[in-house]
């Protein structure tokens, strides 16, 4: 049996580990094993002893028997998935297998679709853990409650002033009032 | 409403392996973190991990690292732990939990028991 | 990690009166004037039911009966009056930090 020596992923990615063996294993199981010992490493998928696809949360593994090769993909790759993992077949007697060295690197967080979900909510704004789904609730709370209410007064009482010392059309006003808002709008979906 | 329904009871063998499901409903399933709690026969609550549902990246409780795998099925909204090589030591209620909007854990699964006896 | 001490373990109260549980954790679990502390209620065979949340507050639908004060390290749940349906095991629980944990647990018998 043989395999690549290193494999390489990013974090958040997937590698795809390909294994050859010779013909006479074509119908035995196949297995990815972890650990740096290959007497104590523990098994993590197995093959069906067919060509059928076997999937196990993150990994998966797939038997091409006619090209006497199997392949396991591991995927969401995790930083502490670096490790050593062994290609097996497992056969009477002892099993055979060969070492294959997973290592998962770092990507830049500029290259790497980030999340902002955090464990639960909280209620103190601190930006270590507080949720989205209550920053967004507050942040409109506070835009129709308290912004769009005070923006109204004074868009109200600039325009009463201007009214007071000349004439404003009555379709002209409801523009200015229209486009103050929207702007005010747009400048908060920028920067909530 | 929330609710989370999750697999059933399970007997194995040590050394065998468990994977229990929680199905969730009543909610978008990636608005919300899941959270999975131990509770041994006659003992507390011990907080095991939580999963980011955007990204499926797991957060683990020291005790819970190497033998215990979370996992999702965003699809399918269901989550998923799995335990290797079982010892009589995880014979217990496997609860999993979501907060919703709620600061605290307002939402549990009924739980699924695994008894691990040779 | 932050250890949370429940007492007493366990309690025996008649109908009617007050039942008192306290809770201590090993650092504070308040941030911003908040105290990141809940309370649950357990009975035999079902999963834990949140009863009151960030120290003090009632979750919706758990009767007035309960209640919960306390900051910093400090916290206590009280049942009164307490009603026969209210024997169970009541854990408190923090989220100040990761991971979590839950008090040891108190187990409510009514006399």
């Known amino acids: 049996i043989q395999g690549p020596a290193l494999v390489r992923g990013p974090e958040q990615g997937s590698v795809t580990v390909q294994c050859r063996y010779s013909s006479r294993w074509q119908t035995n199981k196949k297995w990815w094993c972890r650990g740096a010992s290959w007497s104590t490493c523990r098994v993590l998928i197995r093959s069906t002893g067919s060509e059928k696809e076997t999937k196990s949360g993150r990994l998966s593994i797939r038997d091409n028997q006619k090209n006497h090769s199997f392949q396991v993909t591991m995927e969401m790759l995790r930083q502490n998935d670096t490790d050593t993992y062994w290609c097996g077949i497992e056969k009477f007697g002892t099993d055979r297998g060969t070492r294959v060295k997973v290592n998962v690197y770092s990507v830049g967080k500029d290259t790497m679709s980030t999340s902002n979900q955090l464990p639960w909510p909280t209620v103190d704004g601190s930006t270590d853990m507080v949720s989205s789904d209550l920053q967004k609730r507050t942040y409109y709370m506070l835009l129709v409650f308290v912004k769009v209410p005070a923006l109204l007064i004074l868009v109200g009482a600039v325009l009463w002033l201007k009214r007071s010392t000349q004439k404003v059309p009555e379709e002209q006003w409801r523009h200015t009032l229209c486009s103050d808002l929207d702007s005010e709008l747009l400048a908060k979906d920028i920067s909530p | 409403q929330i609710q989370l329904v999750q697999s059933g009871p399970e007997l194995k063998k040590p050394g065998e392996t468990v994977k229990i499901s929680c199905k969730a409903s009543g909610y978008t399933f990636t608005d919300y973190s899941m959270h999975w709690v131990k509770q041994a026969p006659g003992k507390g609550l011990k907080w095991m991990a939580w999963?980011?549902?955007?990204?499926?990246?797991?957060t683990y409780a020291d005790d819970f690292r190497g033998r215990f795998a979370f996992s999702l099925e965003t699809s399918g909204r269901t989550a998923y732990l799995e335990i290797n090589n079982l010892r009589n030591e995880d014979t217990a209620t496997y609860f999993c939990v979501t907060y919703g909007s709620s600061y605290g854990m307002a939402y549990w699964g009924q739980g699924t028991s695994v008894t691990v006896s040779s | 990690d932050i250890v949370l001490t429940q007492s007493p373990a366990s309690l025996a109260v008649s109908l009617g009166q007050r039942a008192t549980i306290s809770c201590r954790a090993s650092?504070?679990?308040?941030?911003?004037?908040?105290?990141?502390l809940h309370w649950y209620q357990q009975k035999p065979g079902q999963p834990p039911k949140l009863l009151i949340y960030?120290?003090?507050k009632l979750e919706s639908g758990v009767p007035a009966r309960f209640s919960g004060s306390g900051s910093g390290t400090d916290f206590t749940l009280n049942i009164h009056p307490v009603e026969a349906e209210d024997a169970a095991t009541y854990y408190c629980?923090?989220?100040?930090?990761?991971?979590?944990?839950f008090g040891g647990g108190t187990k409510l018998e009514i006399k």
């Open positions: 960030l120290a003090s």
């Open positions: 629980q923090h989220n100040r930090e990761i991971p979590p944990t």
């Open positions: 999963i980011n549902t955007e990204t499926g990246e797991p």
């Open positions: 650092k504070s679990v308040s941030r911003s004037g908040y105290s990141y």
